[in-house]
């Protein structure tokens, strides 16, 4: 909501789940794993990267099955905590100018950075229009007092809010498991809010940061070469 | 394989209440909605609402607001409809449904790929 | 509420024709479509979802477009099998709203 299409291919890390429709984002972060969000867990999904119009074939997707979808063993569906998904592709992306892997981040978000969102998600706050073409938004990292104070009690370690307090620019439904980058790294993973681009109820969103060693020690654990001792 | 198995036929008089099962397999019970639908004899289908299997949060027919609950039991994955005050019009084929949840900012697809076999309800004195 | 308009109501159609249901949103509802088939005694089983996505088993003699308000199901050459009412549904929002029906009939 309040965004702009992004520049054709801009965005080389952003995929599309879907399972016979567009249903959620995600980031790819080596060339056979992509991170989303615990919350668009499917049985069967087809990761699709390389897109800018989801509705037109324009000749540098690369639609792979997923072969193991593994959802945080403390994901809480009902609040939300510890929202990451990972995916392992069928078969290892073809990595090139417009499909490549996102820095996972060293650091965790610091309030005010900048940072890029993107998704195909609706840009509606209020009905429905869900566009066809990679839309981005350019938004800061909010303190974490902010977040708090935006949804008091529902904000845990493992998040953090991205937007403007003011409304009117947000990711929305749609959106779900795509990224936030910052500095060239992988920052969030869209979540959740109440409603979108509403004033005081910023966008809330997975702090990567805290789940780098799950997702070191999880795609370890999922490759051929590892061996059980 | 994934299916929604529901209770048996109920007679009821005017003015009580039934409560309908649908007991879910061959998927996990909590990544799914389940919808109700019901059908009156010679009619169209008439969605009465839906329940979240993860959070428990209702959706209800304006409706039916005040004469229905339902809810889940996800240590047997069941879901269950309850219907009071009974009319002769509540007359119908009752159906649980799946459907995907609504929850965070994942796309909003709210229709019903897997359904039970239907529960005929009558209501007469 | 968003109230859809089916029709026609009943189409009596022969085996091999080509079968044309319409569905009309009284809002945009962007691809948000599913379509039903059903038989006596029997439940609903879908048949296309997200507008123009066949369900998983589904013959594909069965086929559905349209986005916002508009939406069409085709049967491309209708089998005995087939004969039954359609529903279409619109999945955009709550409260979940479907068609009338749509009954085929043999001629």
């Known amino acids: 909501v309040g965004g702009y299409i992004c520049e054709e291919n801009s965005v080389p890390y952003q995929v599309s789940l879907n399972s016979g429709y567009h249903f959620c984002g995600g980031s790819l972060i080596s060339e056979q794993w992509v991170v989303s969000a615990g919350h668009c867990y499917k049985s069967r999904i087809q990761v699709r990267l390389g897109e800018h119009n989801i509705e037109v074939l324009e000749g540098n997707e690369q639609f792979i099955n997923a072969a193991k979808i593994i959802r945080h063993p403390k994901y809480n569906s009902r609040t939300l905590d510890n929202d990451i998904l990972l995916i392992k592709l069928s078969s290892p992306a073809v990595i090139n100018s417009r499909v490549s892997a996102i820095s996972l981040p060293t650091a965790p978000p610091a309030a005010g950075t900048e940072s890029l969102i993107s998704g195909w998600g609706n840009t509606l706050s209020s009905g429905a229009d869900y566009p066809d073409e990679l839309q981005c938004l350019d938004a800061p990292v909010l303190s974490q007092a902010e977040c708090e104070a935006s949804y008091p009690g529902k904000i845990t370690n493992n998040m953090f809010c991205v937007g403007f307090l003011e409304g009117g620019k947000d990711s929305c439904q749609g959106d779900a498991g795509g990224p936030v980058v910052s500095n060239g790294e992988l920052q969030g993973i869209v979540s959740w809010g109440y409603g979108c681009a509403q004033k005081n109820r910023p966008g809330v969103y997975t702090k990567v940061y805290n789940y780098v060693d799950w997702i070191k020690d999880t795609i370890a654990a999922n490759s051929h070469h590892h061996h059980h001792h | 394989q994934v299916q929604l198995v529901q209770s048996g036929a109920e007679v009821k008089k005017p003015g009580a209440s039934v409560k309908v099962s649908c007991k879910a397999s061959?998927?996990?019970?909590?990544?799914?909605?389940i919808s109700w639908v019901r059908q009156a004899p010679g009619q169209g289908l008439e969605w009465m609402g839906w329940i979240s299997a993860s959070t428990a949060d209702t959706n209800y027919a304006q409706k039916l607001q005040g004469r229905v609950t339902m809810t889940t039991d996800t240590s047997t994955s069941t879901a269950y409809m309850e219907l009071r005050s009974l009319r002769s019009d509540d007359t119908a084929v009752y159906y649980c449904a799946r459907g995907d949840e609504v929850v965070g900012k994942r796309t909003y697809y709210i229709g019903m790929d897997v359904w039970g076999q239907g529960t005929t309800v009558t209501v007469s004195s | 509420d968003i109230q859809m308009t089916q029709s026609p109501s009943s189409v009596s159609a022969s085996v091999g024709d080509r079968v044309t249901i319409t569905c009309r949103a009284s809002q945009g509802i962007s691809r948000w479509l599913a379509w039903y088939q059903q038989k006596p005694g029997k439940a609903p089983k879908l048949l296309i979802y997200?507008?123009?996505s066949l369900q998983s088993g589904v013959p594909s003699r069965f086929s559905g477009s349209g986005s916002g308000t508009d939406f069409t199901l085709t049967i491309s050459s209708l089998q005995p099998e087939d004969f039954a009412t359609y529903y279409c549904q619109q999945a955009n929002s709550f409260p979940i709203t479907f068609g009338g029906g749509t009954k085929v009939e043999i001629k």
């Open positions: 997200a507008a123009s």
């Open positions: 061959g998927y996990t019970f909590t990544d799914y909605a």
